[in-house]
């Protein structure tokens, strides 16, 4: 995934000289690009830079440890060997990678940015783009998986392991492609007049594309979860007329609403400000986007720290597995048969399915 700095980018429209040859700036310093974008390139560590770095590294370490814990838990507990959990493990892997990418960024930010070459700067950004795309794509895949299971009235999809592997490969291929696009061409190295302010080697057009791509993904997720919620609400209302358990149905609905609100709320809080900022960078010349950039980058990164909490810590079985791993306890049956899998499946599964299947055990 290293930045390709020898070929002339084919995507960005080059600036032409008098001789009608594209003018490219591969050998220029990072300061050259920053000076043209109006973005401050620090010469020394100030309080804000130190604070961002300190907080960033702390968050990184938490992201990597928390997500590693999720992956280990899913690996060791046979009860988690279902498509939803494989996707959650992949989400944890994406978030773990985000932690690594951010760790690399932390040591190449502030005054250290000056030391970077065009290639290493593109690598730095590419790693972040790859990890965040993988994270978002995983969230989308989980939303799709939940949608399929609810509407097919199953606890777990009948998806084969091979198909899950294909989905995971597609997620990572898409993430790597998205991360590599600027390195292999869609940048402003040969189109200096169209560099962005926030990412001085990225084209304005790429920032707009990147922001819209992620916002559209976000809207799709909202629609999917809204559809799930609407369907479950409809089912529970229908069942509450025919059964004597309206309170249970109401509780189930509230629990579903809570989970969906947490999932989408975290996504909105962590992602929307940064994505909107990218659009404002291009569309609002009078907006001082650079003042909020570092804060919103941290916020987006926090999403990788929150995903293990949201998707895993709400699962009693997962919590128990965590305790076993952290306390080095031997589980009674960590790799035993999966007969208890229905009972121990995630509260997210149960939340979504309890209301749907309360009178229909045969489908499970």
């Amino acid at each position: 995934m290293a930045a390709i700095s020898t070929s002339i980018p084919v995507i960005s429209q080059p600036q032409f000289t008098a001789m009608n040859e594209p003018q490219c700036f591969y050998n220029e310093s990072i300061a050259f690009f920053y000076n043209r974008s109006g973005k401050h390139l620090a010469t020394e560590w100030n309080t804000v830079s130190k604070l961002v770095m300190g907080l960033g590294i702390t968050v990184c370490i938490f992201i990597m440890l928390a997500n590693l814990l999720v992956m280990v838990a899913i690996y060791v507990n046979r009860r988690f060997h279902f498509p939803i959990y494989y996707l959650m493990a992949n989400l944890a892997a994406a978030d773990f990678f985000a932690g690594l990418a951010y760790f690399y960024l932390m040591f190449n930010t502030g005054p250290n940015t000056r030391r970077l070459t065009v290639s290493t700067w593109l690598l730095r950004q590419g790693l972040i783009d790859t990890s965040l795309t993988a994270s978002v794509a995983n969230l989308l895949a989980i939303a799709i998986e939940r949608h399929i299971t609810v509407f097919r009235m199953q606890l777990h999809t009948r998806m084969s392991n091979r198909r899950v592997v294909v989905v995971i490969v597609v997620i990572w291929t898409m993430a790597i492609v998205m991360g590599a696009i600027p390195s292999v061409g869609w940048n402003c190295i040969c189109d200096i007049e169209n560099c962005s302010n926030m990412a001085p080697l990225y084209s304005d057009s790429y920032l707009v594309f990147w922001a819209i791509f992620n916002l559209v993904t976000f809207v799709v997720m909202v629609v999917l979860y809204a559809h799930i919620f609407g369907y479950v609400r409809q089912r529970t209302m229908r069942m509450s007329r025919h059964s004597s358990g309206p309170r249970r149905n109401r509780d189930t609905m509230m629990s579903l609403l809570k989970t969906v609100v947490i999932v989408l709320g975290a996504f909105i809080i962590c992602w929307t400000p940064g994505l909107v900022l990218l659009l404002l960078d291009v569309c609002c010349p009078q907006c001082d986007v650079l003042a909020y950039e570092k804060f919103f980058l941290l916020l987006a990164e926090f999403n990788s720290a929150m995903n293990p909490i949201i998707y895993s810590y709400r699962d009693k079985e997962m919590s128990a597995t965590f305790r076993q791993i952290l306390c080095c306890q031997r589980s009674e049956n960590p790799t035993g048969p999966t007969e208890g899998s229905d009972r121990s499946a995630s509260s997210l599964n149960h939340t979504i399915l309890a209301g749907v299947h309360s009178n229909d055990h045969s489908v499970v």
Partner: antibody, heavy 122, light 107 residues
Framework: QVQLVQSGAEVKKPGASVKVSCKAS????????ISWVRQAPGQGLEWIGE????????YYNEKFKGRATLTADKSTSTAYMELRSLRSDDTAVYFC???????????????WGTGTTVTVSS | DIQMTQSPSSLSASVGDRVTITCRAS??????LAWYQQKPGKAPKLVVY???TLTEGVPSRFSGSGSGTDFTLTISSLQPEDFATYYC?????????FGAGTKLELK
């Protein structure tokens, strides 16, 4: 139309400070960088520094670092250049000049201020 | 810092003449060169930027060329209003420097 109107002429004693203002009109002030250039009598042009009001970032000529301070007031669309510890060789016409492109810095200037004559004499 | 060397320092010409002013940078500045015209008691006026791009409203008799370290400003047919001092300036990035100027006088 786009205009940069500067404050009036100043006469200062050596060691004193001067603050020249440059009021912008006819465009979005924060979208364009503002540079300060001076011209001593019968001499060429000398760049002092630039401020990018959108972010407040400043760039200085090493020669003036520590002696010149560039600021911008977004509410009044006014840029300021303060020069401290004045010497007789600071006697010049001081111009503010607007970047030719918006949202980034092209480091060339299509709109110039009216000029402010600063005379340093004991 | 990048040094800008302009030549000649002064030039006498007549209306209708073709004149060329040259500017040399001490290092590669790609096409980041601007030309300004300044009349006595007035502020400079941007004529050309990016070595060859004419500013809006500048007559087509003005043309700029060059790339790297050597640049020229050409006026194909001098008009009375063209007599002024011309300065080159690199716009590669800070710190910005100007040439010493070329005074274009009526012969």
């Amino acid at each position: 139309q786009v205009q940069l109107v500067q404050s009036g002429a100043e006469v200062k004693k050596p060691g004193a400070s001067v603050k020249v203002s440059c009021k912008a009109s006819g465009y979005t002030f924060t979208s364009y960088g503002i540079s300060w250039v001076r011209q001593a009598p019968g001499q060429g042009l000398e760049w002092i520094g630039e401020i990018y009001p959108r972010s407040g970032n400043t760039y200085y000529n090493e020669k003036f670092k520590g002696r010149a301070t560039l600021t911008a007031d977004k509410s009044t669309s006014t840029a300021y250049m303060e020069l401290r510890s004045l010497r007789s060789d600071d006697t010049a016409v001081y111009f503010c000049a607007r970047e030719s492109i918006s949202r980034r810095l092209g480091w060339n200037f299509d709109v110039w201020g009216t000029g402010t004559t600063v005379t340093v004499s004991s | 810092d990048i040094q800008m060397t302009q030549s000649p320092s002064s030039l006498s010409a007549s209306v209708g003449d073709r004149v060329t002013i040259t500017c040399r940078a001490s290092e590669n500045i790609y096409s980041f060169l601007a030309w300004y015209q300044q009349k006595p008691g007035k502020a400079p006026k941007l004529v050309v930027y990016n070595a060859k791009t004419l500013t809006e409203g500048v007559p087509s008799r003005f043309s700029g060329s060059g790339s790297g370290t050597d640049f020229t400003l050409t006026i194909s047919s001098l008009q009375p209003e063209d007599f002024a001092t011309y300065y080159c300036q690199h716009h590669y990035g800070p710190p910005l420097t100007f040439g010493a100027g070329t005074k274009l006088e009526l012969k």
